[in-house]
């Protein structure tokens, strides 16, 4: 059974992941540039199911495409450093899902824009945090 300290650590990591994703989404929403239109043309795979920490495998597999899209947004008005940001998220995701479990991600048939993708994973984090609070 999970100890209170491990639950607390999980909650903190989820809160950090949530903040990271919210920061990215806020940056994109604030981005007034033709580049934004181009960013929205990129398609992301969405998980068929995302209710457990093991489903973060689906997020991990989309981090490289996410970094590539964010690289488009580099300007003095977009205050994200994609490599640092994605690296930070990757560390959190690996710790949360556990590196020893092998889970094959199942994706939904429909792809999504970066905004829909981020909102989906933000909702995932919020949902799990709510069960831990």
């Amino acid at each position: 059974a999970p100890t209170s300290s491990s639950t607390k650590k999980t909650q903190l990591q989820l809160e950090h992941l949530l903040l990271d994703l919210q920061m990215i989404l806020n940056g994109i929403n604030n981005y007034k540039n033709p580049k934004l239109t181009r960013m929205l043309t990129f398609k992301f795979y969405m998980p068929k199911k995302a209710t457990e920490l093991k489903h973060l495998q689906c997020l991990e597999e989309e981090l490289k495409p996410l970094e590539e899209v964010l690289n488009l947004a580099q300007s003095k008005n977009f205050h994200l450093r994609p490599r640092d940001l994605i690296s930070n998220i990757n560390v959190i995701v690996l710790e949360l899902k556990g590196s020893e479990t092998t889970f094959m991600c199942e994706y939904a048939d429909e792809t999504a824009t970066i905004v829909e993708f981020l909102n989906r994973w933000i909702t995932f984090c919020q949902s799990i945090i709510s069960t831990l609070t």
Epitope: L12, L19, Q22, M23, H79, R81, L85, N88, Q126, S130
Partner: antibody, heavy 113, light 107 residues
Framework: QVQLVQSGAEVKKPGASVKVSCKAS????????MHWVRQAPGQGLEWMGI????????SYALKFQGRVTMTRDTSTSTVYMELSSLRSEDTAVYYC??????WGQGTLVTVSS | DIQMTQSPSSLSASVGDRVTITCRAS??????LAWYQQKPGKAPKLLIY???SLDSGVPSRFSGSGSGTDFTLTISSLQPEDFATYYC?????????FGQGTKVEIK
């Protein structure tokens, strides 16, 4: 638990910049994402933005984008908030807060010619 | 941006009174709502997080309820040290936004 201590009050001329510091102690600095919130005299609370202290990246409220810069120095466990092109409406108390349960004491910035 | 609307903007009450402050979000924020108390010249103090969870060290006379768009902060029996301004805040999405505040004054 982390404690936050902010720099002292500042008086600035319109058009100038101000840099407010927030020093964290008592816990692992990189575990605490830092928000900045300001409060004009007699007014409510206004979120300015957030910095991830580990990676150093930031996200700002649209109202402040282009005028605000948040940075951190991991060697001194300090985060900074710099606001440029100051105007009288920027006269406010500026707070740093981590996790919303720990706040700095506030820094009064007065913009006056 | 999500707008947070508090009511009333001010109220007068006596020690021992039951006080209720409401907060309405312009869209559903689930339970991603916090309540703060602020006294003049001081930083805000977190009272309630996740709509109904009491922060450590906060007296049990404070309670929060609600989900979705409508939330309530209740002080079951007002004490002299409770006269202050109270703010609600959503952290469901960025930008984080606050209510305009409710000032609780002595009748």
């Amino acid at each position: 638990q982390v404690q936050l201590v902010q720099s002292g009050a500042e008086v600035k001329k319109p058009g100038a910049s101000v840099k407010v510091s927030c020093k964290a102690s008592g816990d692992t600095f990189t575990d605490y994402y830092m928000h900045w919130v300001r409060q004009a005299p007699g007014q409510g609370l206004e979120w300015m933005g957030i910095i991830n202290p580990r990676a150093g990246y930031t996200s700002y409220a649209l109202k402040f984008q282009g005028r605000v810069t948040m940075t951190r120095d991991t060697s001194t466990s300090t985060v900074y908030m710099e606001l440029s092109s100051l105007r009288s409406e920027d006269t406010a108390v500026y707070y740093c807060t981590s996790g919303w349960d720990v706040w700095g004491q506030g820094t009064l910035v007065t913009v006056s010619s | 941006d999500i707008q947070m609307t508090q009511s009333p903007s001010s109220l007068s009450a006596s020690v021992g009174d039951r006080v209720t402050i409401t907060c309405r979000a312009s869209q559903s924020i689930s339970t991603w709502l916090a309540w703060y108390q602020q006294k003049p010249g001081k930083a805000p103090k977190l009272l309630i997080y996740a709509a109904s969870s009491l922060d450590s060290g906060v007296p049990s006379r404070f309670s929060g309820s609600g989900s979705g768009t409508d939330f309530t902060l209740t002080i079951s029996s007002l004490q002299p040290e409770d006269f202050a301004t109270y703010y609600c805040q959503q952290s469901y999405s960025f930008p984080v936004t606050f209510g305009q505040g409710t000032k609780v004054e002595i009748k």
